[in-house]
């Protein structure tokens, strides 16, 4: 047994451009809190798989109100560690999910509103009893800095918290077969605590709570001898004629204990040792109440005021499962364009784009302009899977390599005549019109419609469009 400890150092904008908007405002002050979820082994970090190693919620942080005009700073954090107790051995390799939640403190009907601000996930190797490990994770434009460690709860020691230590009974040395406990040299490694009732003569254990039998003995508690003589049937009553004692069906066969309970034989029947949150003869009853906070992801817990009444989690949009622990498959709507691969990271959807595409939804076609230059001062414009050049005046064609006839599009209005010019085109306007494209009528009184003709140009003069 032991405790995983998580210390959040900072949560704020990450480096680089695109600083995130502050999650709080003067109109909607808010505060942060964190949730950590641990899973054994290098398992997938999917939000919907249960936090088999445990989970914990932090306290709420101080109330934060954005200062208008100021850049989003590191946000004020809750005090203290997040602690996830583990009952069995520390697995050494684990996966984690750390969620940053925002609690808005405005005048919402029905109390404060929660929303997930960021989720980071990772897989790590960690020995119990080691020093604090530091980590930095980014989620979008946010950055989370934290440290973590796993420590054993006495009397457990070791990198997996499976060895047990006791104070020395004698000052000089430990008992037979027992070593000193490093780093606690004044303590001795203690025998493991096997399953309750495990035969001290015929059983042993390598992990706390188990009971493994020496050769010649069987049964959950290693109390049943196995005959090596002429017993033919592997199961059945004892045979008086052969002197065989063959165990009959045991009450723990097939493990009648539900929800991960462990079965122990008793003189009359069996007994289930239930994990936390379950009880009943076969651990079939959930003892979790709404006070235990069983609903994840902002789910609302209803009922379950006492261990005898069931609770129900009403999940917010986007979550499902009996504890709101499963995320709806938002990727099934296929939001990624151009063949991009959709990843649901919880706090956001991400698209992994195929080569040649970019953008949050792979909407930008990089191949349009990659390795292609537009000639004669043209600029490349992305779009639609085919590159397009916006050509400088006097040039046209796909790559701006062709000399364009600037008058081909008949740019001069109201019957104006177009002349190609080295720097573009010139319109000679018909009487009564003026402007670079002859677009402005000249009023009968000699005044022109806005904009006025530049000084030095009379209405009707050819005007060069620059």
């Amino acid at each position: 047994a032991g405790v995983f400890e998580l210390q959040i150092h900072s949560f704020g904008p990450g480096p680089g451009p695109g600083a995130p908007r502050s999650p709080c405002s003067a109109r909607l002050p808010c505060r942060l809190f964190f949730r950590v979820c641990l899973k054994p082994g290098l398992s997938e970090e999917a939000a919907e798989s249960p936090c088999a190693l445990g989970a914990a919620l932090s306290a709420r942080g101080p109330v934060y109100t954005e200062q208008p005009g100021a850049p989003a700073p590191d946000l004020p954090l809750p005090d203290g560690l997040l602690q996830v107790p583990f009952r069995d051995a520390w697995p050494g390799t684990f996966s984690f999910i750390i969620e940053t939640w925002r609690e808005e403190l405005g005048d919402q009907i029905g109390g404060p509103a929660w929303s997930l601000l960021a989720r980071v996930a990772g897989r790590r190797r960690l020995a119990a009893g080691g020093p604090w490990a530091r980590d930095i994770q980014r989620a979008g434009a946010w950055e989370l800095r934290f440290s973590y460690r796993a420590r054993c709860e006495p009397p457990a020691v070791g990198t997996a918290c499976t060895r047990l230590c006791r104070p020395r009974s004698a000052p000089s040395r430990c008992g037979p077969g027992l070593r000193p406990c490093a780093p606690l040299e004044d303590e001795c490694e203690a025998p493991l605590v096997c399953r309750a009732g495990c035969s001290p003569e015929h059983g042993f254990c390598e992990q706390p709570g188990e009971c493994r039998c020496l050769e010649g003995w069987t049964g959950p508690l290693c109390t049943v001898p196995v005959s090596t003589s002429s017993c033919l049937s592997p199961r059945g009553p004892s045979s008086a004629t052969t002197g065989c004692l063959v165990p009959g069906p045991g009450p723990c066969d097939g493990n009648p204990c539900a929800n991960g309970g462990s079965c122990s034989e008793t003189p009359r029947s069996f007994e289930c040792t239930c994990p936390r949150g379950f009880y009943g003869l076969r651990c079939e009853v959930s003892g979790v109440t709404c006070a235990d906070g069983p609903c994840f992801n902002g789910g609302l817990c209803v009922g379950g005021a006492d261990p005898d009444s069931a609770y129900i989690c009403h999940c917010p949009p986007g979550f499902q499962g009996s504890n709101c622990e499963k995320r709806v498959d938002r990727c099934s709507l296929q939001p990624c364009r151009n063949g991009g691969l959709c990843l649901d990271l919880g706090h956001a959807l991400r698209c992994r784009c195929r080569a040649g595409f970019a953008g949050p939804r792979c909407e930008h076609d990089l191949d349009d302009c990659a390795g292609r230059a537009c000639a004669n001062g043209g600029t490349c414009v992305e779009g639609g899977g085919a590159h397009r050049c916006s050509c400088a005046l006097g040039f046209g064609g796909r790559d701006c390599r062709e000399r364009a006839d600037p008058c081909a599009a008949r740019p001069c209005a109201h019957g104006g005549r177009c002349y190609a010019h080295f720097s573009g085109l010139v319109c000679a306007c018909a009487p009564g019109y003026m402007g670079a494209r002859c677009e402005f009528p000249v009023h009968p009184d000699g005044a022109s419609a806005l904009p006025a003709a530049p000084p030095g140009l009379r209405p009707g003069d050819p005007q060069r469009y620059l």
């Epitope: 938002r330 709507l333 296929q334 939001p335 959807l349 949050p360 939804r361």
Partner: nanobody, 120 residues
Framework: EVQLVESGGGEVQPGGSLRLSCAAS????????MGWYRQAPGKQRELVAG???????KYAESVKGRFTISRDNAKNTVYLQMSSLRAEDTAVYYC??????????????WGQGTLVTVKP
Amino acid sequence: EVQLVESGGGEVQPGGSLRLSCAASGSIFSINAMGWYRQAPGKQRELVAGFTGDGSTKYAESVKGRFTISRDNAKNTVYLQMSSLRAEDTAVYYCAADVQLLSSDYEFYWGQGTLVTVKP
């Protein structure tokens, strides 16, 4: 903030028809993908029909030929025309949209759901 408002749910007999609509409003720059999910009691939420990010339509196998999704881009609205309804279509139908906000961020939004009940 973006709101998705569904309407059109109700009770209908097997073989009957219903038309659901979902209107998106708020600080929307563009709608990237939009569609309908449903969740029957005790079941996972599943996509029924939708317009994908590439603009194509997608249908669940169980509704092909019976349901038709359409949209009105000017009104930021999608519709689900449901015909030949069966008892197994009974569920809460949720509108969902992947939206590009005015801030240029993309966010995924859900409606509150509308109940469709098919029973004789």
